[in-house]
């Protein structure tokens, strides 16, 4: 049996009061002091079983210094076993022992839950010497107790390599319920059940839980902690909290918002970053995600042309980054572009449509009938061709690019010439004699350089050779050109 000191119970209508037969105290007091001084403590506690010899951790001295009479066994006196008090109160408790004067250098240490209490603790040891024995009172005080002060406190004393251990003094700090698990904010599917958890601890126990949804109590009667609330489904956002009750009162958890997942809002601010002949780089600002992460987006492209069939091209892309390069477009065309994104619930509406245009493209065909012949008198090569049949989308012709490669005895050199769009002939200087010259021509627009014509080769002899026959590419066709000398 243990003696308990306990503060007065504050009745709370929902819950049973203090344990029967227990005492409560919130007083700062010296408990169970066998005082030799005139000080009278506020509360006195007698041992649980007065007169019973204590046979626990005791040191039994062999003999006195004279070697004649035996001394009684050494033991700490019984004191209060259990102190119950509220958080932020002060508490003081003690151990006392009477030690024969033959023992020198006795020290008492305090231990909590098996660990020695060192440093900044308020422990005071007082000595009251008498003729044969010295009464030692070790007191320990805690100001403004906290839950972390809960535990089992003991005194230890070393005498002649023997250790004497006191009965434990159990300190129980009581307060309002303390949450160890609170409900968490969640995003949930409409009309789908989900769970919320609430757990709180004392002391004092029991702790009982009430759930609150949008300010209304869900459970009419308290549920023991921990409590799991299965919410049967929501059609709109709701706020949940839980109330934890014990004999000391009530603690309310944080309120958490439970959101209903929905389709995202449409993206906004679709903008054009770069246009080429066959691609457009766009970006957008994602709309609200509907409380569910975006999965992917869809870029929808319609050609704005009265003659087009109005079909929509759809390009799927990841939701991030919020950018996409639309490819495989026609040059010099107008398009209407919209973006839609999806989450687990579904697709958003399409963003506001924006207009964008591709630039003019490079020519898609090479110049025709390329003819090359040597003008030996002037020491240059004459090149002639026919203007290619380009589509409107390729834009206006701005000129031609001529590539001529000179090959002789393992040496190869490529040169490029640019000529205006009005020309259909050009002359280039002979770079090397006794060599082969290979000529290719490409049409050029603002959109870029088109494909080169098939190569036409002509042999440039050493000085004195005459060659008036031209080399040419057949028009049109893919047959290898013939070199005529």
């Amino acid at each position: 049996a243990i003696t308990e000191a306990r503060e007065e119970a504050k009745p709370y209508p929902l819950f049973p009061g203090p344990l029967p037969g227990s005492l409560q105290t919130d007083h700062t007091s010296l408990l169970s002091l066998p005082h030799t001084s005139g000080y009278q403590p506020a509360l006195m506690f007698s041992p649980t079983q007065p007169g019973r010899p204590y046979t626990g951790n005791v040191a039994i001295p062999r003999v006195t210094s004279a070697g004649s009479k035996l001394l009684p066994p050494l033991a700490f006196k019984h004191t209060v076993g259990h102190i119950i008090l509220s958080e932020h109160k002060d508490v003081k408790f003690n151990c006392s022992i009477s030690v024969p004067n033959i023992y020198q250098d006795t020290t008492i240490s305090w231990w909590k839950d098996g660990k020695e209490l060192l440093g900044a603790h308020h422990a005071i040891t007082q000595f009251y010497p008498d003729d044969e024995v010295t009464a030692i009172i070790a007191s320990f005080s805690i100001t403004s107790v906290q839950r972390s002060d809960n535990g089992s406190y003991i005194c230890k004393m070393k005498i002649n390599n023997e250790e004497i251990v006191s009965d434990p003094i159990y300190i129980e700090v009581q307060g309002l319920p303390h949450f160890t698990k609170q409900p968490e904010s969640m995003n949930v599917t409409r009309n789908t059940a989900f769970n919320l958890t609430c757990q709180a601890v004392g002391p004092p126990e029991p702790v009982n839980i009430f759930w609150v949804q949008n300010s209304s109590r869900v459970n009419e009667q308290p549920e023991k902690s921990p409590s799991v609330l299965t919410v049967p489904g929501l059609t709109e956002m709701a706020v949940f909290s839980c109330e934890a009750h014990n004999d000391k009162g009530l603690t309310v958890s944080k309120g958490v918002q439970i959101n209903i997942k929905a389709i995202p809002s449409p993206p906004t601010e679709v903008s054009i970053h770069n246009s080429t002949a066959h691609s457009i780089l766009i970006s957008w600002v994602p709309g609200f995600d509907g409380y569910s992460p975006f999965r992917n987006c869809s870029v929808q492209v319609k050609e704005v042309d009265p003659l087009s069939n109005g079909s929509v091209m759809i390009f799927n892309t990841s939701a991030s980054p919020h950018m996409y390069q639309i490819k495989q477009l026609q040059a010099l065309a107008n398009y209407s572009i919209g973006v839609s994104c999806m989450n687990e619930i579904g697709w958003s509406a399409v963003s506001p449509w924006i207009l964008a245009s591709t630039t003019e493209g490079a020519p898609s065909v090479a110049p025709l009938n390329v003819t090359v012949f040597l003008n030996e008198s002037r020491d240059n090569v004459d090149i002639r061709w026919m203007k290619p049949l380009t589509k409107r989308q390729a834009g206006e012709l701005v000129g031609y690019r001529i590539s001529h490669v000179w090959q002789s005895a393992g040496i190869s050199k490529e040169l490029l010439e640019e000529v205006g769009q009005n020309n259909s002939r050009a002359q280039i200087s002979v770079q090397v004699h006794n060599a082969t010259c290979t000529v290719r021509i490409a049409a050029v627009t603002k959109g870029g350089v088109g494909p080169f014509s098939d190569p036409v080769k002509i042999f440039i002899p050493a000085h004195g050779w005459v060659d008036h026959a031209p080399s040419s590419t057949p028009a049109p066709g893919n047959a290898d050109p013939v070199l005529i000398i």
Partner: antibody
């Protein structure tokens, strides 16, 4: 299994009192509230209120204060409805029901017919 | 208090037909419960919290709704479904019931 068993029919004179019992079994009585519902002949259901079986605290709906008293004997897992100063208009079937979360009445007693007639 | 209005008061249908019962609340409520009552019997729980079937209730019963408008649907009436149906709100005290809808055989 969960059961709510109500006392038998009562025939009372105006001005008398009646006490209807509702004995619960198959669950921990003090974990769930007990609701009382009235149904007058040929009429719909009318919620009278409930009693907290953990604290014994009753809650009465408007129109059921004064002459109506909810009580408990937790030792025998029983809830009681007492009506005093009976009137002819108190003639009805009185049901007890177990209250679950969200005030859902998940189990019902079989009902007790109280007839008030001179 | 929240007043619950059930409509229609009486619904005359044949077995196999679809029954749609309405319950309107005078102000918004989070959940609606539904009960079935046959003559001389206690009410029987049917639907918990708007759309959850009570144990042992067949899948032809379903509930839906939110705010102030709730519906109980019986997809194909069986002979044993002809009864009176009551809605009951959860959100605020007192815990009110609707006036009931009687589903009778046509």
């Amino acid at each position: 299994q969960v059961q709510l068993v109500q006392s038998g029919s009562e025939l009372k004179k105006p001005g008398a009192s009646v006490k209807v019992s509702c004995k619960a079994s198959g669950y921990t009585f003090t974990n769930y509230g007990v609701h009382w519902v009235r149904q007058a002949p040929g009429q719909g259901l009318e919620w009278m209120g409930w009693i907290n079986t953990y604290t014994g605290e009753p809650t009465y709906a408007q129109g059921f204060t004064g002459r109506f008293v909810f009580s408990l004997d937790t030792s025998v897992s029983t809830a009681y409805l007492q009506i005093s100063s009976l009137k002819a208009e108190d003639t009805a079937v009185y049901y007890c029901a177990r209250g679950y979360r969200y005030a859902y009445m998940d189990y019902w007693g079989q009902g007790t017919l109280v007839t008030v007639s001179s | 208090e929240i007043v619950l209005t059930q409509s229609p008061a009486t619904l005359s249908l044949s077995p196999g037909e679809r029954a749609t019962l309405s319950c309107r609340a005078s102000s918004s409520t989070s959940y609606m419960h539904w009960y079935q009552q046959k003559p001389g019997q206690a009410p029987r729980p049917l639907i918990y919290a708007t759309s959850n079937l009570a144990s042992g209730i067949p899948a032809r019963f379903s509930g839906s709704g939110s705010g102030t408008s709730y519906t109980l649907t019986i997809s194909s009436l069986e002979p044993e479904d002809f009864a009176v149906y009551y809605c009951q709100q959860w959100s605020s005290n007192p815990r009110t019931f609707g006036g009931g809808t009687k589903v009778e055989i046509k």
